[in-house]
C-alpha cells in the first residue's frame, strides 16, 4: 500500500559538512517498526546512503559506519547527514516503510536537494 | 511484465519446517530487492522478509527473526525462504515480491502460495 511522505525542497549544509531535515510521513494506523533508507539521486544514478529501522519512540538504529543519525518523534523523522563534500551535492530522498503491525505501507518523498559547499581553506598566516 | 511463481507451501505440523522458492522463469533478475510477504485470513498483508539483490543483505519482521531464513541462488535466479520451527500463527498466504529499482515499491507479486501449519 502507497504513503504519502513529505520533505523539505532545499537544505543547505553546513561549513562542517553536517546536513538535516525533516521526513514525515502519513501513517494510516499506528506503526511500532519503522525502517528508513536515504538514497542519494545525481546524474540518474540514485544510491542507497544509509538506512535505519526503528521502534516508535526510540532511536533510529544505522549501521556503525553509517554517514546518518536520526531521531523520531510520532511521525517523524529528524535525519542528519555528516562528512559532506561539494560533490555529494545531490537529490536526497526518504524511503519510509511501516513494518509492524500489518498491513505494510511504503513510501517515497521527493527528495531534499542539498546544496555542499566546501569551505575556502585558510590562507596561510606569516 | 516479471512473472514471480512461488512453489513449496503446503500443511506441516507445528515445529516443522517448509522452504518456499520464488522464481522469475527465463528472467535474469536485476531487481533491487526480493521479499516475502503473507496475509492471513481477514488480516493486512504482513512483511516477512527481505534480500537486496546486489549484496544479499537481508532484514526479518520480528516475528519470524531465527525461524525464517531468506536467501538467493543467483545462477537459479531464484529467492527461497526457509521457514523452521512452525507455528499456527505462521498460517498464511505467502507471496514472493520484486522491487524493480531502489525508488520503486513492490513493483512485481507471485500469485501466493498457501502455508497451513496445524497444532
Known amino acids: 500500500k502507497a504513503m504519502h511522505v513529505a520533505q523539505p525542497a532545499v537544505v543547505l549544509a553546513s561549513s562542517r559538512g553536517i546536513a538535516s531535515f525533516v521526513c514525515e510521513y502519513a501513517s494510516p494506523g499506528k506503526a511500532t517498526e519503522v525502517r528508513v533508507t536515504v538514497l542519494r539521486q545525481a546524474d540518474s544514478q540514485v544510491t542507497e546512503v544509509c538506512a535505519a529501522t526503528y521502534m516508535m519512540g526510540n532511536e533510529l538504529t544505522f549501521l556503525d559506519d553509517s554517514i546518518c543519525t536520526g531521531t523520531s518523534s510520532g511521525n517523524q523523522v529528524n535525519l542528519t547527514i555528516q562528512g559532506l563534500r561539494a560533490m555529494d551535492t545531490g537529490l536526497y530522498i526518504c524511503k519510509v516503510e511501516l513494518m509492524y503491525p500489518p498491513p505494510y505501507y511504503l513510501g517515497i518523498g521527493n527528495g531534499t536537494q542539498i546544496y555542499v559547499i566546501d569551505p575556502e581553506p585558510c590562507p596561510d598566516s606569516d | 511484465e516479471v512473472q514471480l511463481v512461488e512453489s513449496g507451501g503446503g500443511l506441516v505440523q507445528a515445529g516443522g519446517s517448509l522452504r518456499l522458492s520464488c522464481a522469475a522463469p527465463?528472467?535474469?533478475?536485476?531487481?533491487?530487492?526480493m521479499g516475502w510477504f503473507r496475509q492471513a485470513p481477514g488480516k493486512g498483508r504482513e512483511f516477512v522478509a527481505d534480500?537486496?539483490?546486489?549484496?544479499?543483505?537481508?532484514y526479518y519482521a520480528d516475528s519470524v527473526k531465527g525461524r525464517f531464513t531468506v536467501s538467493r541462488d543467483n545462477a537459479k535466479n531464484t529467492v527461497y525462504l526457509q521457514m523452521n520451527s512452525l507455528k499456527p500463527e505462521d498460517t498464511a498466504v505467502y507471496y514472493c515480491?520484486?522491487?524493480?529499482?531502489?525508488?520503486?515499491?513492490?513493483?512485481?507479486w507471485g500469485q501466493g502460495t498457501q502455508v497451513t501449519v496445524s497444532s
Open positions: 534480500i537486496r539483490w546486489s549484496d544479499g543483505r537481508t
Open positions: 515480491a520484486a522491487q524493480g529499482g531502489v525508488l520503486s515499491g513492490w513493483d512485481y
Open positions: 527465463g528472467r535474469t533478475f536485476s531487481n533491487y530487492a
